[in-house]
Interface confidence: low
């Protein structure tokens, strides 16, 4: 016997309370596949999140971050404040890199300057808060037949792995009940 719900296309759900009629997904919900018995809530791009792609009856909304913030996590689950080059984001906001460290991006942490002497090289160009040092050639590099030396491009900050911040709430008055009322899913820092 064929499941009557299998005839319900994407954008609808099989409504058990109406004799398994294929009902359209209500506003702000979607079903991306046929035969679904529920529609999923559309992601709401609110606050620091910005809508990159509107939700439709068959696909979820996609968010990115407003200017001055950048995405973190799978599917842009969080927005983190941008800092200037030469700074890093701390719990107290953007702070200048300490002496001996640099950050050449608007995100990420300050990293130590390269230690040229570890490779037997000298410092050709001093480091700044925004740039790594440039190491000069070692004596071996200048021996006959050596390749020409070009300063290395500054190392790029590796991509952030998804981070999960947890807001811990206890008891009945958790302040999260509005999720079930307004059906908003937002990141609150």
């Amino acid at each position: 016997l064929q499941d009557p719900c299998s005839n319900c296309p994407a954008g609808t759900f099989c409504d058990n309370n109406r004799n398994q009629i294929c009902s359209p997904c209500p506003p702000n919900s979607f079903s991306s596949a046929g035969g679904q018995r529920t529609c999923d809530i559309c992601r709401q791009c609110k606050g620091v999140f910005r809508t990159r792609k509107e939700c439709s009856s068959t696909s979820n909304a996609e968010c990115d971050c407003t200017p001055g913030f950048h995405c973190l996590g799978a599917g842009c689950s969080m927005c983190e404040q941008d800092c200037k080059q030469g700074q890093e984001l701390t719990k107290k906001g953007c702070k200048d890199c300490c002496f001996g460290t640099f950050n050449d991006q608007k995100r990420g942490i300050c990293r130590p300057w390269t230690n040229c002497s570890l490779d037997g090289k000298s410092v050709l160009v001093n480091g700044t808060k925004e740039r790594d040092v440039v190491c000069g050639p070692s004596p071996a590099d200048l021996s006959p037949g050596a390749s020409s030396v070009t300063p290395p491009a500054p190392a790029r900050e590796p991509g952030h792995s998804p981070q999960h911040h947890h807001h811990h709430h206890g008891g009945g008055g958790s302040g999260l009940n509005d999720i079930f009322e307004a059906q908003k899913i937002e990141w609150h820092e």
């Epitope: 309370n17 018995r37 079930f180």
Partner: antibody, heavy 123, light 112 residues
């Protein structure tokens, strides 16, 4: 249709920690919540907390605050419940369940449950 | 926390006869959006719980129409119009109108 498949039974010593996984297969992972519910032998159901897989925040019952950590990895469609400082009274079957705050059906209810993971705490 | 109290705790039933389980909450479950998130679950022996009813009275997919829910505010009832042998197990009510979610202590339904 979505299924929730949990990790296998565990035997733990008092004072240690246990981490139970719950993998979703066959559907969206990021648009609903995962709750964890436990059931001690011969007892009723007790809600421990919930997590939203993409937003990353978790809500915990006061009783477990500080001892439980609920997380999710959207890339593998897996939720985790870690309980620390285990004692004998934590011996129970631990269930994950899909918790749906959606417009149509069903709201504020657990429509899909994992098969349960028995955690035995014994010295 | 909201306390959910079920009665009776044990219910011997005769197949074909009706059965009724009561669930009371320690405070109103009507949420600010005028919704009441009260659901009912059946846990058959050796199985995970399964959803029967949500939002007081809405039957979940595949649940036979002999199951019905009713109530409002703080008093809720699950009725089985004609009990069948497969209906045995422990029935739980649960509120999700506020955190933390809380369950009733369960009602064990068994055949006489």
């Amino acid at each position: 249709q979505v299924q929730l498949v949990q990790s296998g039974a565990e035997v733990k010593k008092p004072g240690s920690s246990v981490k139970v996984s719950c993998k979703a297969s066959g559907g969206e992972f990021s648009n609903y919540f995962i709750s964890w519910v436990r059931q001690a032998p011969g007892q009723g159901l007790e809600w421990m907390g919930m997590v939203h897989p993409i937003e990353g925040w978790a809500v915990y019952a006061q009783k477990f605050q500080g001892r439980v950590t609920i997380t999710a990895d959207e890339s593998t469609s897996t939720a985790y419940m870690e309980l620390s400082s285990l004692r004998s009274e934590d011996t129970a079957v631990y269930y994950c369940a899909r918790d749906r705050p959606v417009f149509c059906c069903p709201r504020g209810a657990f429509d899909i449950w994992g098969q349960g993971t028995l955690v035995t705490v014994s010295s | 926390d909201i306390v959910m109290t079920q009665s009776p705790l044990s219910l011997p039933v005769t197949p074909g006869e009706p059965a009724s389980i009561s669930c009371r909450s320690s405070q109103s479950l009507v949420s600010p959006g005028d919704n009441t998130f009260l659901s009912w679950y059946l846990q058959k022996p050796g199985q995970s719980p399964q959803l029967l009813i949500y939002e007081i009275e809405r039957r979940f997919y595949g649940v036979p129409d002999r199951f019905s829910g009713s109530g409002s505010g703080t008093d809720f009832t699950l009725k089985i119009s004609r009990v069948e042998a497969e209906d045995v197990g422990v029935y739980y009510c649960m509120q999700a109108s506020t955190f933390p979610r809380t369950f009733g202590q369960g009602t064990k339904v068994e055949i006489k």
